[in-house]
Interface confidence: low
Amino acid sequence: EWVMPPIFVPENGKGPFPQRLNQLKSNKDRGTKIFYSITGPGADSPPEGVFTIEKESGWLLLHMPLDREKIVKYELYGHAVSENGASVEEPMNISIIVTDQNDNKPKFTQDTFRGSVLEGVMPGTSVMQVTATDEDDAVNTYNGVVAYSIHSQEPKEPHDLMFTIHKSTGTISVISSGLDREKVPEYRLTVQATDMDGEGSTTTAEAVVQILDANDNAPEFEPQKYEAWVPENEVGHEVQRLTVTDLDVPNSPAWRATYHIVGGDDGDHFTITTHPETNQGVLTTKKGLDFEAQDQHTLYVEVTNEAPFAVKLPTATATVVVHVKDVNEAPVFVPPSKVIEAQEGISIGELVCIYTAQDPDKEDQKISYTISRDPANWLAVDPDSGQITAAGILDREDEQFVKNNVYEVMVLATDSGNPPTTGTGTLLLTLTDINDHGPIPEPRQIIICNQSPVPQVLNITDKDLSPNSSPFQAQLTHDSDIYWMAEVSEKGDTVALSLKKFLKQDTYDLHLSLSDHGNREQLTMIRATVCDCHGQVFNDCPRPWKGG
């Protein structure tokens, strides 16, 4: 029958070549001579000449060793023709399958594999995967089936079998408990890849397992007891630096310390922060300490890490005894800022108020008073009693020194300590008004027409407060009322001047008396320019028109 089963040829054959593989035979050779030929890749197309056929006998010949890793299978066609070249058979499929020899070692894809795992993990935790390849056949043979193993481990601590490797996947896992970064930060494993599923050729690579830090070490105080001396009253004063040691990775959250005051600071006088470089606890005063109230504080400070503990660990506590040092404290005015009312215009020497200070120190000290700021020089203080009296005329309407009716004075109290200290008090004098100013009209010049004149309106102002100001009253005096009329508005803060009779163009002086609601009168001269014009006039009298 004109068929041929697949021909299996091992790769790397030693010959001798040409090597006879199989004989093609057509049963149509009775009475006629048959010539055989082959076509296809490996015969008449690249790679040419690997196979030939003896034309007359039909023997298929192999001319060289085959390499399965290059070509696994050759598909050729066998042809049979008669002497006259006529085809006597259909082309026959010839499959030549190259069978594998274990001629390739495994190759790791890297020289060094790197992985990491957290210290203290449970056995069974996966760490990393290594991979090796083998070009041989892993489907039909074991030649290309790679088996992984761990050849050695360095260091061999706490023992020499800390890791295992999955034979077929190359996954490295933790097999023993006891990974401790603080003892062994890195393991170097020599891993092997062996073909024939572990029975053949071997190649090696290195697997580096970095042990990652877990927060399995608590910070410890070194020392645990501290004693410090702090002057009273100082805010932000560094009291003490507390030092800790931690075996975890420096500058990591598992190493960085977090401090808490857990006792002894009922008055909330202290705060503790972590120094960013030294990791020390910096204890400082949040409020000033008071020697007279409490001369010693015993604080209890606890330290943890930024990161939570990975396992249950005891929390370290330190004791800090803070001794408060007495300082000569400045006298304190009571209240520090005193608001009092005083009437403007009071007599010189008249008592304004008494403003005294108290000394916080335990020993009695003499306090003397001075005025440090009195811009208008209106006041004096008795150095012993703190009595403040008028030394000048207090003027509420003096805008240079008085703002919003308030005159501000600074008083000093100095104790007799060595060296002496001085405290400051602020006296805010609210000046009450007296009727010491009369009403003033604005402007004091008017210009008006002598025919159908428009009344000229003046604003009235008074520096005093109500009831010593508006509503105002107006009156023309010294015969000014013969030709002129003054009318105060309904609101009482403006006055309108108008002509009662015709006056020729000229300048006239009017005597206007204005009085406030407290009946204080003020006489003001108003200069009135009368123009030959009708109705309203602005700036100057119009020039007379001259006909030409």
């Epitope: 190759k107 790791f108 894809t109 890297q110 020289d111 060094t112 594999f113 790197r114 990393m128 995967q129 290594v130 991979t131 390849t133 070009e135 892993a138 290309g144 089936v145 790679v146 077929s168 996947t169 190359g170 996954t171």
Partner: antibody
């Protein structure tokens, strides 16, 4: 910033030689496998060579085996491709590429490419 | 050698619509360690290729969620749930399981 900067491309006659370079920065070069991939004009991507992180292992397709050599200098953070016996069909844009971390043979960072023209 | 065959070779798409690219390997690309090293790359016009997906379905960092991968053995698919203008370029599948490493011939995605 992780970067691969290529140099060394140019015009060469058939049978000639050329050396491509790839300078790495922004990562620990010695811990990554590296490869060269090429792209002929108007065609797709073709893998050319691979070298393991320490340089012990090299891999090539049959099309370049025996003619091209991949190498690396970890001290200089540099990858090289020495191309000998060049043919017209080697004309392409050549890319160097970094293997994804670990043992995986695929490429997460690529160079900008350098053109090699083989013509008489 | 393992041959990677992509279809279609050209894919005109409408923005906002889904798109799908198929990749078939001539033999299984499951490695002996159980991993399937099938990756997808995109080469935008005038640029170097960039990694999109690795080990069949894992998104590389910075790749939008609308791009996903699936498949096993010899048949693999890349899907874009809603195409955007920035998705145009040539998509290549790639096998890294067996040497020689091989790419698909590419699928050109362009806006209609």
């Amino acid at each position: 910033e992780v970067q691969l900067v290529q140099s060394g491309g140019g015009l060469v006659k058939p049978g000639g030689s050329l050396r491509l370079s790839c300078a790495a920065s922004g990562f620990t070069f010695s811990t990554y496998g590296m490869s060269w991939v090429r792209q002929a004009p108007g065609k797709g991507l073709e893998w050319v060579a691979t070298i393991s992180d320490g340089g012990s292992y090299t891999y090539y397709p049959d099309s370049v085996k025996g003619r091209f050599t991949i190498s690396r200098d970890n001290a200089k953070n540099s990858l090289y491709l020495q191309m000998n016996s060049l043919r017209a069909e080697d004309t392409a844009v050549y890319y160097c590429a970094r293997h994804y971390y670990g043992s995986d043979w695929y490429f997460d960072v690529w160079g900008q490419g350098t053109t090699v023209t083989v013509s008489s | 050698d393992i041959v990677m065959t992509q279809s279609p070779s050209s894919l005109p798409v409408t923005p906002g619509e889904p798109a799908s690219i198929s990749c078939r390997s001539s033999q299984s690309i499951v490695q002996s360690n159980g991993n399937t090293y099938l990756e997808w790359y995109l080469q935008k016009p005038g640029q170097s290729p960039q990694l999109l997906l690795y080990k069949v379905s894992n998104q590389f960092s910075g790749v939008p969620d609308r791009i996903s991968g699936s498949g096993s053995g010899t048949d693999f698919t890349l899907k874009i749930s809603r195409v955007e203008a920035e998705d145009v370029g040539v998509y290549y599948c790639f096998q890294g399981s067996h040497v020689p490493l091989t790419f698909g011939q590419g699928t050109k995605v362009e806006i209609k």
